[in-house]
Amino acid sequence: MAVTACQGLGFVVSLIGIAGIIAATCMDQWSTQDLYNNPVTAVFNYQGLWRSCVRESSGFTECRGYFTLLGLPAMLQAVRALMIVGIVLGAIGLLVSIFALKCIRIGSMEDSAKANMTLTSGIMFIVSGLCAIAGVSVFANMLVTNFWMSTANMYTGMGGMVQTVQTRYTFGAALFVGWVAGGLTLIGGVMMCIACRGLAPEETNYKAVSYHASGHSVAYKPGGFKASTGFGSNTKNKKIYDGGARTEDEVQSYPSKHDYV
């Protein structure tokens, strides 16, 4: 029973995690304009992996897709790749794990096959989660580097009367969604791997016993006797002033209210 619960819980946790990774990848708020210690603007900028958006205080939002592929920073491309790999592995893992679930009967599938599938999906979830966490972390590191660079620029070259306010970007909601989702997928994968141990039939090796009969001796070699243990006992059960359908094309949304404090 514990194995089924662990496997089922692992599947559900991974499912939530992968849904989160997909959501994070699609979200526009990977980086958002830093409002702290800045003059209050009536325009709010935020950027995703696929497009950048500008929300005017009046309520209009305009988004523009990154139509270039070669012109994008290598780091952004790497983050995109990591997130997509994470989604693909996660999706395959989900597909495999559905058939591996102990509570689902598919033909005369043996427990050994289910165990192998559970382990495979578990590993896939772990790698998927790691890809998401890596992708989000790379992007976050990029933001931190750029933030301090633009902060340094803000306090240089301001001798003249006219000042230029540098737009600084900080962590957006998608980063936190990505980290949590990646962590959940990772945990789900670990749970699947633990469940696999309980599903796998154990091999019991009997030591060779020599019989000295009159005439010639016969040695019985250890055979491949398999004991089906059923539910393993070795498994463990472990949460300003105050600032739409989208296409890759430029989009303007219906007005909505935004505050800036």
Partner: antibody
Framework: QVQLQQSGTELVKPGASVKISCKAS????????MNWLKQRPGKGLEWIGQ????????NYNGGFRGKATLTADKSSRTAYMHLNSLTSEDSAVYFC???????????WGQGTSVTVSS | DIVMTQSPSSLTVTAREKVIMNCKSS????????????LSWYQQKPGQPPKLLIY???TRKSGVPDRFTGSGSGTGFTLTISSVQAEDLAVYYC?????????FGAGTKLELN
Amino acid sequence: QVQLQQSGTELVKPGASVKISCKASGYAFNSYWMNWLKQRPGKGLEWIGQIYPGDGDTNYNGGFRGKATLTADKSSRTAYMHLNSLTSEDSAVYFCARWGTGNTMDYWGQGTSVTVSS
Amino acid sequence: DIVMTQSPSSLTVTAREKVIMNCKSSQSLFNSGNQKNYLSWYQQKPGQPPKLLIYWASTRKSGVPDRFTGSGSGTGFTLTISSVQAEDLAVYYCQNNYFYPLTFGAGTKLELN
């Protein structure tokens, strides 16, 4: 079409208060910020503040905080500006204007003249 | 607060003449997110409310004659009237739409010779 109809001319005594109205029609009143502006005779325009009728949220120009109070009534699609402790400095034409694309005042009321005189 | 400086304060012109008026802001009104300048131009005729002509520094509001052209970026902006008509005689204001509080220039008065 979008229309903003403001209340008529006001003649008030110093120290008194006045409430100017701006009735909107022809658009989704709750979904656009309404701005209020002041124009003294022969002078430029000053932004007083803005209100979002959808939830009553407001932003004020620091120079008018305490002087002006902005409110809105969703049911009658009307925005109001209450001016208190009036002095001769408050004698001006007051405009309401809808906030549109590009953070611009795209439609304006005809203006309400307020004269403070004893 | 952002200071908007307009020049000249008044202009005396003749019909069909080309007119250029300037507006300078104390801080850049350029937003890198959408590559747009948050400056608008308004026209105000005597006894009337201001009327929006140009937004995003160079985008004409629908219904505005094409003789009105806005240009500039960052801190320096211009409004050009290619061929002045009698009905264009008014006061023209530039406005900062980027920073709170929203501020206006003192205006450029266009008069007929």
